[in-house]
């Protein structure tokens, strides 16, 4: 006959660990049910009767099987230089990434805590390396033969026109100009348009809280009796 | 035995402020919710809020923001109310309590009594 | 904020009664609901919570029910240490709040 199937709450066999999306709780001394995603333990379990789970607050939520006593406040709102690519739900906390043309200068374990603009390079020096998500765009000046006429965080130095016969020589910060005949572009090796920084913010697929010591109120939250209840592994 | 060992009673002016202290034993300090319950003479109870000693995050009931402040001291296991610029209002016994979850309060201190009077 | 009523402020009964004190919500409050004891010393002890779960310690002559808005506590068997106040508390919804309280005599 197969072995009978505990129900919670149970005292488990010495030396072995509750089951899945289940708990030891210290007090009762009983293996108990955990609260799903989006639910909190407002009554704790004793030895005859289990956990009791509530749906988490508005602006609040529990992204893992757990037994917080409090649901984590979702993170305020995303500020202007930033978008919501992840909205506040029982569920998930809110997660905010910077706007094209940004990029995030303090991030945190989802989205980013601070914006920067990404550094424009300006006339005579030209994007050595992109801007990305998480780093501002590196400039250097143009090298002799290339150009830079624009101040932008994607140009990069193009090499001069090649005159027949030229007007004006090119410096850094300007292109040669030839006279009547029409000019051939030279190509200097190199001399290719780098990618525009990517836009649309790609956002983390396996989020994991952070720790309750963290500066942003949104996750100082009471996290119940040790282990961390959230996060905990057995999910 | 869990204890919540309470300061002694208190008479002050009006307008003054004052800090209640509860010196909490014989459990887990920072596992545990501290609220702060009001009574006034021959009334019910009301809950002023409370405090999570683990990472010192409160919360209060609206009538009583900017009235009182909890704040706890892990390393003497013991929590705080300061409550600011008093009136005749403000006299009562002020009882602290644990909770595990943050609703229902198993363990009481014994009461301070407030007496704001010039 | 939640409103608690305890519509009996005082009742007095003998020792060995049986005594039901009823404690109504202004809304359901989800079987969320305690119940405490005052003795005449101000002492509070915590008596049953979440409507019907005796806490440790407390005999087993007390006892709790309801659900939606009306709760009860009932002591099954009067004894002349269970002479306080008692008071019934949601958790349903912040702010908690109290009934006015039930004070018990003994006849």
């Known amino acids: 006959l197969p072995a009978q199937v505990a129900f919670t709450p149970y005292a488990p066999e010495p030396g072995s660990t509750c089951r899945l999306r289940e708990y030891y709780d210290q007090t009762a001394q009983m293996c108990c049910s955990k609260c799903s995603p989006g639910q909190h333990a407002k009554v704790f379990c004793t030895k005859t009767s289990d956990t009791v789970c509530d749906s988490c607050e508005d602006s609040t939520y529990t992204q893992l099987w757990n037994w917080v006593p409090e649901c984590l406040s979702c993170g305020s709102r995303c500020s202007s230089d930033q978008v919501e690519t992840q909205a506040c739900t029982r569920e998930q906390n809110r997660i905010c990434t910077c706007r094209p043309g940004w990029y995030c200068a303090l991030s945190k374990q989802e989205g980013c805590r601070l914006c920067a603009p990404l550094r424009k390079c300006r006339p005579g020096f030209g994007v050595a390396r992109p801007g990305t998500e998480t780093s501002d765009v590196v400039c250097k000046p143009c090298a002799p033969g290339t150009f830079s006429n624009t101040t932008s965080s994607t140009d990069i130095c193009r090499p001069h026109q090649i005159c027949n016969v030229v007007a004006i020589p090119g410096n850094a910060s300007m292109d040669a100009v030839c006279t009547s005949t029409s000019p051939t572009r030279s190509m200097a090796p190199g001399a290719v348009h780098l990618p525009q920084p990517v836009s649309t913010r790609s956002q983390h697929t396996q989020p994991t809280p952070e720790p309750s010591t963290a500066p942003s109120t949104s996750f100082l939250l009471p996290m119940g009796p040790s282990p961390p209840a959230e996060g905990s592994t057995g999910d | 035995q869990v204890q919540l060992q309470q300061s002694g009673p208190e008479l002050v002016k009006p307008g003054a402020s004052v800090t209640i202290s509860c010196k909490a034993s014989d459990y887990s300090f920072t596992n545990y919710y501290i609220h702060w319950v009001k009574q006034r003479p021959g009334q019910g109870l009301e809950w002023i809020g409370w405090?999570?000693?683990?990472?010192?995050?409160?919360k209060y009931h609206e009538k009583f923001k900017g009235k009182a402040i909890l704040t706890a001291d892990t390393s003497s296991t013991t929590a705080y109310m300061q409550l600011n610029s008093l009136t005749s209002e403000d006299s009562a016994v002020y009882f602290c309590a644990r909770s595990r979850a943050t609703g229902y309060f198993d363990y009481w201190g014994q009461g301070t009594t407030l007496t704001v009077s010039s | 904020d939640i409103q608690m009523t305890q519509t009996t402020s005082s009742l007095s009964a003998s020792l060995g009664d049986r005594v039901t004190i009823s404690c109504r919500a202004s809304?359901?409050?989800?079987?969320?609901l305690n119940w405490f004891q005052q003795k005449p010393d101000g002492t509070i002890k915590l008596l049953i919570y979440?409507?019907?779960r005796l806490h440790s310690g407390v005999p087993s002559r007390f006892s709790g029910s309801g659900s939606g808005t009306d709760y009860s506590l009932t002591i099954s068997n009067l004894e002349q240490e269970d002479m306080a106040t008692y008071f019934c508390q949601q958790f349903n919804t912040l702010p908690w709040t109290f009934g006015g309280g039930t004070k018990l005599e003994i006849k």
């Open positions: 979440y409507t019907s």
């Open positions: 405090i999570y000693p683990g990472n010192v995050i409160t």
């Open positions: 809304q359901d409050i989800r079987n969320y």
